[in-house]
């Protein structure tokens, strides 16, 4: 049992996570994350599963956030903007979008960097998972600190 | 002892700060802040030091955030994007980047405004300091509410 | 009394809200919100009033945030950037700006989407209200997850 967990006592441990983006060869639009660098994983009441979703064991209100930096060019990209979505999958429920942000592609060559930040307070059920989806994962920047994902239980 | 500190009892006081950007004639890339306007400084367990870093006295998990609004022009700026970095200096450790955001310069004349928001959960040691670094401080907007920096202890 | 309120006991209930943007025919620059979709309203210690402001009953430190996605075009808009402001109205006080973000309009046609995120820690008095103001509400995107507003009490 770690120091975060002990601060509030066994009944109400601190629950928080912050994970770091990881480049992936997978063709999925769901971003991949890792417990590397200056990451946070308070205890086993929140876990990173399959490198793609943060899963919580306890029901409650959570502040959930994601930051995505990407590099794109208007001519080389589809007409649609770059969209990052924070999504929820609860046991027995369909996936749903919690938050989205959209940025039109830059005219800078070869590509122009832009950063998106998402964050909000949501109730999560036991076993609920949150994940981040983007329109084009190949455009995401994985340099130190550029793209991250996390939550904290209120 | 103020009302924030008393809410949770002496053992677990609320710790939070929100400081306001200040224009600086210094040539450093580290942004300057002030306890002015509608600022927050919950108690002496978090302090603003040298106008540039928020320093905490207690170990724990903190949600740390910064918002930077800047005005730049592609032709008048270097080719590199505007980057804002949230950085950490812990006693006996090197400075390190926690979070970064990048925005390509605007083509608007004389300059185009853009806003960056950074935020994440990190463990801080006693005496740790967090600060904000930017590629070009002269481009930062200091109008009311545009650029700010803060943290809260979970 | 709901489950959020009970978690911390009657003396220190959880207080949090997350509301969803709503298109409005009103000509006001203050954004409209609704308790719809995946919204949060922890208890009656925070309320959405007139569909435009979050009002708190208890004094304390709150992390307040807003996200606004908008679609605009440089030629079709005024020369001034799109600005989103998080504002405070306390009983017996003038309204004041807490946070602002600015983004220059896109050159994309018919319009280019961009997202703004605002967030910070502020002390609120009993009866204080926070609201979001934008330069042009007609440009705001109301698709699922694009524009939201919330707070949590520390």
């Amino acid at each position: 049992e770690n120091s975060f967990e002990m601060q509030k006592g066994d009944q109400n441990p601190q629950i928080a996570a912050h994970v770091i983006s990881e480049a992936s060869s997978k063709t999925t639009s769901v971003l991949q994350w890792a417990e590397k660098g200056y990451y946070t994983m308070s205890n086993n009441l929140v876990t990173l599963e399959n490198g793609k979703q943060l899963t919580v064991k306890r029901q409650g209100l959570y502040y959930i956030y994601a930051q995505v930096t990407f590099c794109s060019n208007r001519e080389a990209s589809s007409q649609a903007p770059f969209i990052a979505s924070l999504c929820l999958k609860s046991p027995g429920r369909f996936e749903r979008i919690l938050l989205r942000a959209a940025n039109t592609h830059s005219s800078a060559k070869p590509c122009g960097q832009q950063s998106i930040h998402l964050g909000g307070v949501f109730e999560l059920q036991p076993g609920a998972s949150v994940f981040v989806n983007v329109t084009d994962p190949s455009q995401v920047s994985h340099g130190t600190g550029f793209t991250s994902f996390g939550l904290l239980k209120l | 002892e103020n009302s924030f500190e008393m809410q949770k009892g002496d053992q677990n006081p609320q710790i939070a700060a929100h400081v306001i950007s200040e224009a600086s004639s210094k040539t450093t890339s580290v942004l300057q802040w002030a306890e002015k306007g509608y600022y927050t400084m919950s108690n002496n367990l978090v302090t603003l030091e040298n106008g540039k870093q928020l320093t905490v006295k207690r170990q724990g998990l903190y949600y740390i955030y910064a918002q930077v609004t800047f005005c730049s022009n592609r032709e008048a700026s270097s080719q590199a994007p505007f980057i804002a970095s949230l950085c950490l200096k812990s006693p006996g450790r090197f400075e390190r980047i926690l979070l970064r955001a990048a925005n390509t310069h605007s083509s608007a004349k004389p300059c185009g405004q853009q806003s960056i928001h950074l935020g994440g959960v990190f463990e801080l040691q006693p005496g740790a300091s967090v600060f904000v670094n930017v590629t070009d401080p002269s481009q930062v907007s200091h109008g009311t509410g545009f650029t700010s920096f803060g943290l809260l202890k979970l | 009394e709901n489950s959020f309120e009970m978690q911390k006991g009657d003396q220190n209930p959880q207080i949090a809200a997350h509301v969803i943007s709503e298109a409005s025919s009103k000509t006001t620059s203050v954004l409209q919100w609704a308790e719809k979709g995946y919204y949060t309203m922890s208890n009656n210690l925070v309320t959405l009033e007139n569909g435009k402001q979050l009002t708190v009953k208890r004094q304390g430190l709150y992390y307040i945030y807003a996200q606004v996605t908008f679609c605009s075009n440089r030629e079709a808009s005024s020369q001034a950037p799109f600005i989103a402001s998080l504002c405070l109205k306390s009983p017996g006080r003038f309204e004041r700006i807490l946070l602002r973000a600015a983004n220059t309009h896109s050159s994309a046609k018919p319009c280019g989407q961009q997202s703004i995120h605002l967030g910070g820690v502020f002390e609120l008095q009993p009866g204080a209200s926070v609201f979001v103001n934008v330069t042009d509400p007609s440009q705001v995107s109301h698709g699922t997850g694009f524009t939201s507003f919330g707070l949590l009490k520390l």
Epitope: G37 | T28, S29, V30, K89, G92, F94, E95, S129, F131 | -
Partner: nanobody
């Protein structure tokens, strides 16, 4: 590539003071963490003090922090070490070291030699009793 050249060493009596300098040339030293180490005759090289690249925050060896002060002048690209109340046991070759800000390793402790990318040739300080 950064070149580091120390100066200011010499013979000094116990209780005296010295100021060492380290001139950095090459790529901008603004982006480097800088430190002083020392190596006494027949002993291992040990950490003295470090100063961070952005904040200018300082870290010291516990046994030296009351007498030694590290500082830097970014305009002159120079690192300094002010040494007061010198003792015979301070006799050593003093080395200037630099580490790139962007450099990450498994350890990020400022007092570990392995974490520095560039070293000067050293300057000898002799304290007589």
């Amino acid at each position: 590539e950064v070149q580091l050249v120390e100066s200011g060493g010499g013979l000094v009596q116990a209780g005296g003071s010295l100021r060492l300098s380290c001139a950095a040339s090459g790529r901008t030293p603004l982006n480097y963490h800088m430190a002083w180490f020392r190596q006494a005759p027949g002993k291992e090289r040990e950490f003295v003090a470090a100063i961070s690249s952005l904040l200018g925050s300082t870290d010291y060896s516990d046994s030296l922090k009351d007498r030694f002060t590290i500082s830097r002048d970014n305009a002159k690209a120079t690192l300094y070490l002010r040494m007061n109340n010198l003792k015979p046991e301070d006799t050593a070759v003093y080395y200037c070291a630099a580490r790139e800000t962007t450099h990450y390793s498994t350890s990020d402790r400022v007092n570990e030699m392995r974490n520095y990318d560039y070293w000067g040739q050293g300057t000898l300080v002799t304290v007589s009793s």
